[in-house]
Interface confidence: medium
């Protein structure tokens, strides 16, 4: 399976909400011993690799934001922890999973990574990730709403296969 990032760049005004999205593509094993660990974290765009560094998003780690479920099941993070930080990660039946960030500030600008780990018999068998950039702007040059820029199909950084 693969992870695709429909948009590689999100440009948003301060105070707006944004939903960053990744999509799980390809056949997904629905066996009873197979589960999926999905999560989000911040990173830095390294010279060679993207998403190797795992930083918290608004003080929530990838462990805090993770979803763990079988196949294309729907899931979302615990509301109390997420809402305190203005965050929620969610996953639907169609392979889409997302993180919503509310009331954006300039400090939210940066590189965001989604990660999916396929786990069989408690071993992480396959791992795929996607990267996207969030730019939060303020002042007269800031857009009135979030503007999204589609990923190039040639951008190998944004689609990784297991």
């Amino acid at each position: 399976f693969k992870v695709a990032t429909p948009y590689s760049l999100y440009v948003c005004p301060e105070g707006q909400n944004v939903t960053l999205t990744c999509r799980l593509l390809g056949p997904v094993d629905k066996g009873h011993d197979v589960t999926f660990y999905k999560t989000w974290y911040r990173s830095s765009r390294g010279e060679v690799q993207t998403c190797s560094e795992r930083r918290p998003i608004r003080n929530l780690t990838f462990q805090d934001l993770h979803l763990h479920h079988g196949g294309h099941q729907a899931a979302n993070t615990s509301h109390d922890l997420a809402q305190r930080h203005g965050l929620e990660s969610a996953s639907d039946h169609h392979g889409n999973f997302s993180i919503t960030m509310r009331n954006l500030t300039l400090l939210d600008s940066g590189l965001y990574c989604c990660l999916v780990v396929e786990i069989r018999h408690h071993h992480s068998e396959h791992r795929v990730h996607g990267a996207m950039e969030l730019q939060v702007q303020t002042g007269k040059d800031a857009p009135s709403n979030c503007v999204v820029y589609p990923s190039s199909s040639q951008d190998s950084e944004n689609i990784t296969a297991a």
């Epitope: 690799q49 190797s52 795992r54 780690t61 462990q63 071993h123 791992r127």
Partner: antibody, heavy 120, light 107 residues
Framework: EVQLVESGGGLVQPGGSLRLSCAAS????????MSWVRQAPGTGLEWVSG????????FYADSVKGRFTISRDNSKNTLYLQMNSLRAEDTAVYYC?????????????WGQGTLVTVSS | DIQMTQSPSSLSASVGDRVTITCRAS??????LAWYQQKPGKAPKLLIY???SLQSGVPSRFSGSGSGTDFTLTISSLQPEDFATYYC?????????FGQGTKVEIK
Amino acid sequence: EVQLVESGGGLVQPGGSLRLSCAASGYIFTGYDMSWVRQAPGTGLEWVSGIDGHFDSSFYADSVKGRFTISRDNSKNTLYLQMNSLRAEDTAVYYCARSSYAVDLAFDYWGQGTLVTVSS
Amino acid sequence: DIQMTQSPSSLSASVGDRVTITCRASQGISSYLAWYQQKPGKAPKLLIYAASSLQSGVPSRFSGSGSGTDFTLTISSLQPEDFATYYCQQHYTTPPTFGQGTKVEIK
């Protein structure tokens, strides 16, 4: 039974190079991130470098960045650490360690260690 | 990088004693803290991860607690095989960092 066995340590002069290996067995190697952690004589533990289980994404401590390179050969169940431009302060026992679960950074299995001595 | 500070750096205790070691992080790490035991000439052994989760095969006399910046490892009744050096480690973010260690010696 999970086993990690390091090799390749030894005496090397300052500025020299050394390549450490860590042979893994008893589990599905590709399923786990791996790290090198070192311990200088009589001191504490210092994480050196880590590598992703599938993508070879690597990350390094500032003290070794640009001098050390971590890699893995999943077909051989082996982790490597190429150490160049070695300094006296790199003298330590080097352990390879497995990250415990999915994307975590705690280390549930360690090798026995291999001693690297940098001295003229 | 997140700095980890352990106290005490060493302690003397007797078999059967209750022993407590503390670890402080330079910034909040939620509950992402691990504890290791190391004996001379041996590799570290994972005792506890996620602040309070006991690693498989580790005796129940070991327990961990804490959240945020302050954490504790407790050995409820010290056994002869527990004399060793103990390290805390944050597994909150890259790079993972260790405390300087606490040596538990025989009184």
